[in-house]
Amino acid sequence: HTAAQDNCTCPTNKMTVCSPDGPGGRCQCRALGSGMAVDCSTLTSKCLLLKARMSAPKNARTLVRPSEHALVDNDGLYDPDCDPEGRFKARQCNQTSVCWCVNSVGVRRTDKGDLSLRCDELVRTHHILIDLRHRPTAGAFNHSDLDAELRRLFRERYRLHPKFVAAVHYEQPTIQIELRQNTSQKAAGDVDIGDAAYYFERDIKGESLFQGRGGLDLRVRGEPLQVERTLIYYLDEIPPKFSMKRLTA
């Protein structure tokens, strides 16, 4: 990002307001909604992105079967509470004092309760399974080419360390990308798998969060990879706590 006032922008987050008013005249960008300063050399946290969105005008090739504890984000958009580091607060509440506990990617992991609900810690999502269905093509993609292209995408576009892309599975037309990142593995400066998955999800939907970059143009050996359905499963280090009522529903 550049100091010249007209070019002071955040390449990794277009939902920001930037000005060269940082220390020494540094270009400093703040997320819409929260007003928190963001580091434009890396991905912005999902919590700040959701908050900004709410503030804006209205190796085996076998596919993975998500575990019984896998969470899907069925609740959709909400205006989250973020901590000073931009992470989700463990407890989230809406305007009607309905509260619930979330994991590190902001997905609800308990039944909804009232203001007396306690969420002792922010439970880390250490395994993310991105399940994609691609549009029909003349033939199946070559698995190793597809694997290489998706790994390159996560490394270059989302700056996610290659070691966190655990596997890419393919059984036409279904592609699954497994991201794994334990608390102990994540070093300072590492992109969080939850943030990378969110940027990818928005890219796939044609809602890129990057400033001024074209939308995602995924190609495998020159052949366009067009996604028609996306499902993301989240696995936490501690299994979620839902009542039997929900589990049998």
């Epitope: 010249a4 220390p23 005249g25 540094r26 050399s41």
Partner: antibody
Framework: QVQLVQSGAEVKKPGASVKVSCKAS????????INWVRQATGRGLEWMGW????????GYAQKFQGRVTITADESTSTAYMELSSLRSEDTAVYYC?????????????WGQGTMVTVSS | DIQLTQSPSSVSASVGDRVTITCRAS??????LAWYRQKPGKAPKLLIY???SLQSGVPSRFSGSGSGTDFTLTISSLQPEDFATYYC?????????FGQGTRLEIK
């Protein structure tokens, strides 16, 4: 080419004020902030403050708060640094500096420096 | 305020030598660190910004590394014009601060 040209050396008495100018050329003045840094003889560099000429926003080091005022005149592409209640410890070379184009808070263009001597 | 501590305070070396200067911040500053070279009677000259990016026109013998609290400036092969004083500077938070300087002298 891009440059910052500062006013000449000054000799002042304790308690007086000094106003140093810094004229920018070779770039759009209002597109970049201006920082002021001083250096006493044989000592290190000390940041005093900064101004964004377009917004008028300023920031000063706590040490100089209340004694330093940074202003700018867009019509002449000139920045000014005024230091009041001068004391002998203020004897130093005063530099103006522009942040780099990369927006990283590093200073890529510096003035030649203005020697300010405070002596009774 | 963030304190920057440079080491060594002074170093003697010869032309062609490899020299490393370190700068330690009192708290994390991400990669918001710059390095300057200053010759007597002259204004400082920017060498490295954002901890490791080489300023345009600066010879490739200069390199920077580090992030967080520990940073390094390396001169791979000293040239006569490199004998000067070197400063690190942080732009992570107000106020901007400089290290105390490292004097590089001819052995």
């Amino acid at each position: 080419q891009v440059q910052l040209v500062q006013s000449g050396a000054e000799v002042k008495k304790p308690g007086a004020s000094v106003k140093v100018s810094c004229k920018a050329s070779g770039y759009t003045f209002t597109n970049y902030g201006i920082n002021w840094v001083r250096q006493a003889t044989g000592r290190g560099l000390e940041w005093m403050g900064w101004m964004n000429p377009r917004s008028g926003n300023t920031g000063y080091a706590q040490k100089f708060q209340g004694r330093v005022t940074i202003t700018a005149d867009e019509s002449t592409s000139t920045a000014y640094m005024e230091l009041s209640s001068l004391r002998s410890e203020d004897t130093a070379v005063y530099y103006c500096a522009r942040p780099n184009t990369g927006g990283d808070g590093a200073f890529d263009i510096w003035g030649q420096g203005t020697m300010v001597t405070v002596s009774s | 305020d963030i304190q920057l501590t440079q080491s060594p305070s002074s170093v003697s070396a010869s032309v062609g030598d490899r020299v490393t200067i370190t700068c330690r911040a009192s708290q994390g500053i991400k990669s918001w660190l710059a390095w300057y070279r200053q010759k007597p009677g002259k204004a400082p000259k920017l060498l490295i910004y954002r901890a490791h990016s080489l300023q345009s026109g600066v010879p490739s013998r200069f390199s920077g590394s580090g992030s967080g609290t520990d940073f390094t400036l390396t001169i791979s092969s000293l040239q006569p014009e490199d004998f000067a004083t070197y400063y690190c500077q942080q732009a992570n938070s107000f106020p901007v601060t400089f290290g105390q300087g490292t004097r590089l002298e001819i052995k």
